[in-house]
Interface confidence: low
Amino acid sequence: DFGLDCDEHSTESRCCRYPLTVDFEAFGWDWIIAPKRYKANYCSGECEFVFLQKYPHTHLVHQANPRGSAGPCCTPTKMSPINMLYFNGKEQIIYGKIPAMVVDRCGCS
Amino acid sequence: DFGLDCDEHSTESRCCRYPLTVDFEAFGWDWIIAPKRYKANYCSGECEFVFLQKYPHTHLVHQANPRGSAGPCCTPTKMSPINMLYFNGKEQIIYGKIPAMVVDRCGCS
């Protein structure tokens, strides 16, 4: 699998992964004990036909061209978890692996 | 996990799974021996904030609002394979499980 990596200086217009640090303190999310910030990354960019298509299905839908199908969009195609320490609704401290918190790769889907 | 199912008579504007039969013969894809047609389905519709979001990450990116992030789009969140019989590039007949050919669920990602 392949995906592009970019930053704010990139001139790339196609679907790409960009760096993003999420800051829970800045959001006022005080129920999160750790981490206070983490590297989430995000996907942005154009999905020209066939570029970075993750699934053959995407190509087939384009070929069939049904009513209302909008074409593929730039979205996470590989994600990974992070460990978090947080208060749940009952004010208990929970340590757990939270899935799909980090974008590792972007593609057109 | 939850996803909406719609059909061509639905008035639903939000992200939804629609039925789609892919017809390989109609495409002229004569290297596919079987199936000649199959139910692929597709995703279409609007992704209002928080509706059908698959990942907490989607919410966090919306909150952080980085430059160029386009907001979530309606995309397959669960897919399944189908078995296919086809000719490969060397004219050999191959029987195999092809991943991600059927959309089982749609969501905002």
Partner: antibody, heavy 122, light 110 residues
């Protein structure tokens, strides 16, 4: 106790090879990124490379080809194989564990060994 | 590859004084910066990661700030045990692979 212990350092002639070991205890080796960092006498820290959770390796450009990082999960040990050694490779070699993925920061080394001295001299 | 430049090279201050160490990256590194403290004969100790997050067990007098290319480590009130060399470190690129350290700043107690 959670710790990293390096071994295998010593005196080696120019052009020679050496394999350093880093024995880990108190945690599962394969759950963390492991890195090697060196420090020449009186100098600053210099990154050599890492082996990630999947077992993929990444190296500083100067180390590529001469230095190889590997691991043996069954022995809870990470290795640094050094070939074609030169006088300028004389340094204390540290093994370090990547920060756990609170924050998903692969290269924040939050646990270090005490280091092992490698001297390259004839 | 990104190059990290620390200033000053050496700093000599009295206990209780405020210490400001600088680290500059040759290109934007977002928040991908860590600070380490190293005392003679010891391995480095992680103080700060992601530019401003205090590592576990680190006293609150240490504070990291900055983003992009300019970063600062501040010790609000210098203690005798803070005498050490301080290194900044980044990852080279979004994919996290490749690391660069600054050349270090030595903090001495008068």
């Amino acid at each position: 106790e959670v710790q990293l212990v390096e071994s295998g350092g010593g005196l080696v002639q120019p052009g020679g090879s050496l394999r350093l070991s880093c024995a880990v205890s108190g945690f599962t080796l394969s759950h963390y990124v492991k890195g090697w960092v060196r420090q020449a006498p009186g100098k600053g820290l210099e990154w050599i490379g890492i082996i990630n959770i999947e077992g993929s390796t990444y190296y500083a450009s100067w180390a590529e080809g001469r230095f190889t990082i590997s691991r043996d999960n069954s022995k809870n040990t990470v290795y640094l194989q050094m070939n074609s050694l030169r006088a300028e490779d004389t340094a204390v070699y540290f093994c370090a564990r990547g920060h756990d993925n609170f924050g998903y920061s692969y290269h924040d080394f939050n646990l270090w060994g005490q280091g092992t001295l490698v001297t390259v001299s004839s | 590859a990104v190059v990290m430049t620390q200033s000053p090279a050496t700093l000599s201050l009295s206990p209780g004084e405020r210490v400001t160490l600088s680290c500059q990256a040759s290109q934007s590194i977002h928040h991908d910066l860590s600070w380490y403290q190293q005392k003679p004969g010891q391995p480095p100790k992680l103080l700060i990661y992601l530019a401003s997050t205090l590592a576990s067990g680190v006293p609150s007098r240490f504070k990291g700030s900055g983003s992009g290319t300019d970063f600062t480590l501040t010790i609000s009130s210098l203690q005798p045990e803070d005498a050490a060399t301080y290194y900044c470190q980044t990852y080279d690129g979004i994919s996290h692979y490749g690391v660069a350290f600054g050349q270090g700043t030595k903090v001495e107690i008068k």
